[in-house]
Amino acid sequence: ATKLTEEKYELKEGQTLDVKCDYTLEKFASSQKAWQIIRDGEMPKTLACTERPSKNSHPVQVGRIILEDYHDHGLLRVRMVNLQVEDSGLYQCVIYQPPKEPHMLFDRIRLVVTKGFSGTPGSNENSTQNVYKIPPTTTKALCPLYTSPRTVTQAPPKSTADVSTPDSEINLTNVTDIIRVPVFN
């Protein structure tokens, strides 16, 4: 069984999710990479991807998602700006490696976006919510469509664990087919 871990981010509407996915530099530097959402009972859906081949430090923006692939650091940076409640969900980074199936990067991100002010909870209710105006699209990359001989028919179980501290991880075990990820646009 593959052991999957998640890190949970609890943010307010209007804030930015800013995360990284590490990858093996020598192996995947120029490979095309994607940011996916995994909804219960559905296969992962690609929301944005880098160009092919992936360009170093070249921002790709698709709506409110900005991807930057730092080849020299071996990391993909993902930002989701001006978060909305509907953005809540489970996300992952994958690397496209045709003709093989996408390679999933750990750890997954469990994003929880709540309504309310982006000031510290308990602070003055007059604090200003950060509604950041998104600049024009930088580059919009086309993401490939993959088909797979084995499909994931069910997303990993939604953990009921209470994850409140930054260091907590949700460990998902007995998940066998997760590495095979067909991608839909």
């Epitope: 804030q15 930015t16 990284k20 730092y70 650091h73 700006v81 600049p135 930054p166 260091d167």
Partner: antibody, heavy 121, light 105 residues
Framework: QVQLVQSGAEVKKPGASVKVSCKAS????????IHWVRQAPGQGLEWMGW????????NYAQKFQGRVTMTRDTSISTAYMELSRLTSDDTAVYYC??????????????WGQGTLVTVSS | SYELTQPPSVSVSPGQTASITCSGD??????VSWYQLKPGQSPVLVIY???KRPSGIPERFSGSKSGNTATLTISGTQAMDEADYYC????????FGGGTKLTVL
């Protein structure tokens, strides 16, 4: 609990090199970036670079490129920062710090106690 | 290179509210952290993700962000809050602001 313990104070001559260590405990060493930050007397905090203990890859601030080397020994969960061609401007307290999470580069939630490096002829 | 701008100093009377700002290009797209640094001690994270307090940080510390300016607010400031405060963000590299010396009169 997470702890970062640094090596002791150093006195070096101009032109020499210094190697500061940072021993990590209380967590999986490979899982989190280690950063090095310094503060010179009367100056602010200055980020020097990060080390990915898993891959051994490092990213250095432009100011220190070619003069700093960050390495690690995973068998003893220790990160190292070596700074060469020292000048008096390198006199500072050097800190190692750990990322709060595996999936972020900032913030730095855990810090070493600091190592004072004095460069003097 | 990316820069974060802070006022060099801020003064406040005990019990009053202190506000320290940090501004930078496209800061609205980045998460801001704040650190407290006292002489002879290691930095302490007081705010992360713009407005979250780590455990152990008093409730009088709060953070907010509007557009490209982040603000650290200390309400009911105490003498023990006198320190240097630094904002931080991640551009291509990690960047600290120049620091603000908070004096409690």
């Amino acid at each position: 609990q997470v702890q970062l313990v640094q090596s002791g104070a150093e006195v070096k001559k101009p032109g020499a090199s210094v190697k500061v260590s940072c021993k990590a405990s209380g967590y999986t060493f490979n899982g989190y970036y280690i950063h090095w930050v310094r503060q010179a007397p009367g100056q602010g905090l200055e980020w020097m670079g990060w080390l990915n203990p898993n891959s051994g890859g490092a990213n250095y601030a432009q100011k220190f490129q070619g003069r700093v080397t960050m390495t690690r020994d995973t068998s003893i969960s220790t990160a190292y920062m070596e700074l060469s061609r020292l000048t008096s401007d390198d006199t500072a307290v050097y800190y190692c710090a750990r990322d709060q999470r595996k999936t972020t580069v900032t913030p730095f939630e855990y810090w070493g106690q600091g190592t004072l490096v004095t460069v003097s002829s | 290179s990316y820069e974060l701008t802070q006022p060099p100093s801020v003064s406040v009377s005990p019990g009053q509210t202190a506000s320290i700002t940090c501004s930078g290009d496209k800061l609205g797209e980045r998460q801001v952290s704040w650190y407290q640094l006292k002489p002879g001690q290691s930095p302490v994270l007081v705010i992360y993700q713009d407005n979250k307090r780590p455990s152990g940080i008093p409730e009088r510390f709060s953070g907010s962000k509007s557009g490209n300016t982040a603000t650290l607010t200390i309400s009911g400031t105490q003498a023990m809050d006198e320190a240097d405060y630094y904002c931080q963000a991640w551009d291509r590299n990690v960047v600290f602001g120049g620091g603000t010396k908070l004096t409690v009169l």
